[in-house]
């Protein structure tokens, strides 16, 4: 019986540790996508509706803030699209990019952790164009550090929650 009690306590401890593991999955706020054809920061994301969720991390001022030191897996998926019903592209040669950036408040500095994308030729003869970028990586993050997303050509972003999103989850502690 004692062994069983010990075992269930162990399960509970494991479960609560897992439940305390920080994670976030943020989806684009389609009502507030900035305009521009140059690199812009995406600051409006959902954290509590649809697929979006957050736990033991903070979302503030367009940035995902780390609350616990640790090794995290960061990911971002950005979809760009254009359909002729919205008009014509002013230029057919496009650089479609995403940048995942880490900002440290303690030692004011900013680093691009990941970038992805391509130059594209989206011909005016086609009715529809689509391009998707997915980046992911394993990073040591400290409490207080902030993760943000920058993209080129935000007016071409696909605003669906299954298309444009980013997130993080803690994988292990820093030894």
């Amino acid at each position: 019986e004692k062994a069983m009690v010990d075992g269930s306590w162990l399960d509970l401890a494991k479960r609560s540790k897992l439940e305390a593991q920080p994670f976030a999955h943020l989806t684009i706020n389609a009502t507030d996508i900035p305009s521009g054809s140059h690199k812009v920061s995406l600051s409006s994301w959902y954290h509590d509706r649809g697929w979006a969720k957050i736990s033991n991390m903070t979302f503030s001022n367009g940035k995902l803030i780390v609350n616990q030191d640790g090794f995290y897996y960061l990911y971002a998926n950005i979809c760009f699209r254009h359909h002729e019903t919205s008009g014509d592209l002013a230029t057919e040669y496009l650089q479609l990019m995403v940048y995942v950036t880490k900002t440290s408040i303690k030692i004011p500095s900013s680093h691009t952790l990941m970038k992805g994308g391509s130059t594209k030729y989206w011909s005016g003869n086609s009715e529809f164009h689509f391009y998707s970028i997915n980046v992911g990586g394993f990073f040591k993050l400290r409490s207080g550090e902030e993760i943000s997303i920058e993209v080129s050509n935000p007016s071409l972003l696909d605003p669906d929650q299954d298309a444009t999103y980013f997130g993080a989850f803690k994988v292990r502690d820093i030894d």
Epitope: S35, G36, E84, T85, S86, G87, D88, A90, T91, N153
Partner: antibody, heavy 126, light 103 residues
């Protein structure tokens, strides 16, 4: 205030060419596209083509492809539309119109014509 | 190629009347629809863009609604200066126009 001022009325014989100008003022000419639209007597408005005043990119209606040239002079803030091999059916009022999209903020030419020229009557008659 | 169809082609109404013009697209165009006013010898004027957004400087008696393939322009209280031909437009395609006259 934003203004588009077009050149005066023209009379041409069939087979000839005409070049209509559209002078812009009151905004940064290079940041917007200019469209050309015409209206023949008793007909609906008809889109002809656009030019991105910033980079000179153009797009034309299939109907006018090969007969139309649209250019711009950024220093003079002026767009030009030349139509060649004129026929009597080309008798119309020709308008230039500004696209509402500021190219600094976006790259989609949205076809919202927020300012128009006063129109240029082109008569094609033998 | 999308075709825009307006109805009626002309109408006559009294000052103060509510006037409604309909525009249909041959396929769904979301909310990418604009309305223009044309008066003879004058530059055309953008009234409504994006189906329902009122262009700056346009009187509030003009309003637009609809999405998909069916749209309407409404003049809530017709004024003498509203005598004109009204056109709907989606990108490269225009409707055939509706001529509005005063009774």
């Amino acid at each position: 205030q934003v203004q588009l001022v077009q050149s005066g009325a023209e009379v041409r014989k069939p087979g000839a060419s005409v070049k209509v100008s559209c002078k812009a003022s009151g905004y940064d000419f290079s940041n917007y596209a200019i469209h050309w639209v015409r209206q023949a007597p008793g007909q609906r408005l008809e889109w002809m083509g656009w030019i991105n005043a910033g980079n000179g990119n153009t797009k034309f209606s299939q109907k006018f492809q090969g007969r139309i040239t649209v250019t711009r002079d950024t220093a003079a803030s002026t767009a030009y539309m030349e139509l060649r091999s004129l026929r009597s059916e080309d008798t119309a009022v020709y308008y230039c119109a500004r696209d509402s999209t500021n190219m600094v903020r976006g790259i989609i030419i949205a076809y919202y014509f927020d300012y128009w020229g006063q129109g240029t009557l082109v008569t094609v008659s033998s | 190629e999308i075709v825009m169809t307006q109805s009626p082609s002309s109408l006559s109404a009294s000052v103060g009347d509510r006037v409604t013009i309909t525009c249909r697209a041959s396929q769904s165009i979301s909310r990418y629809l604009n309305w223009y006013q044309l008066k003879p010898g004058k530059a055309p004027r953008l009234l409504i863009y994006g189906a329902s957004s009122l262009q700056s400087g346009v009187p509030s008696r003009f309003s637009g609604s609809g999405s998909g393939a069916e749209f309407t322009l409404t003049i809530s209280s017709l004024q003498p200066e509203d005598i004109a031909t009204y056109y709907c437009q989606h990108t490269r395609a225009f409707g055939q126009g509706t001529k509005v006259e005063i009774k």
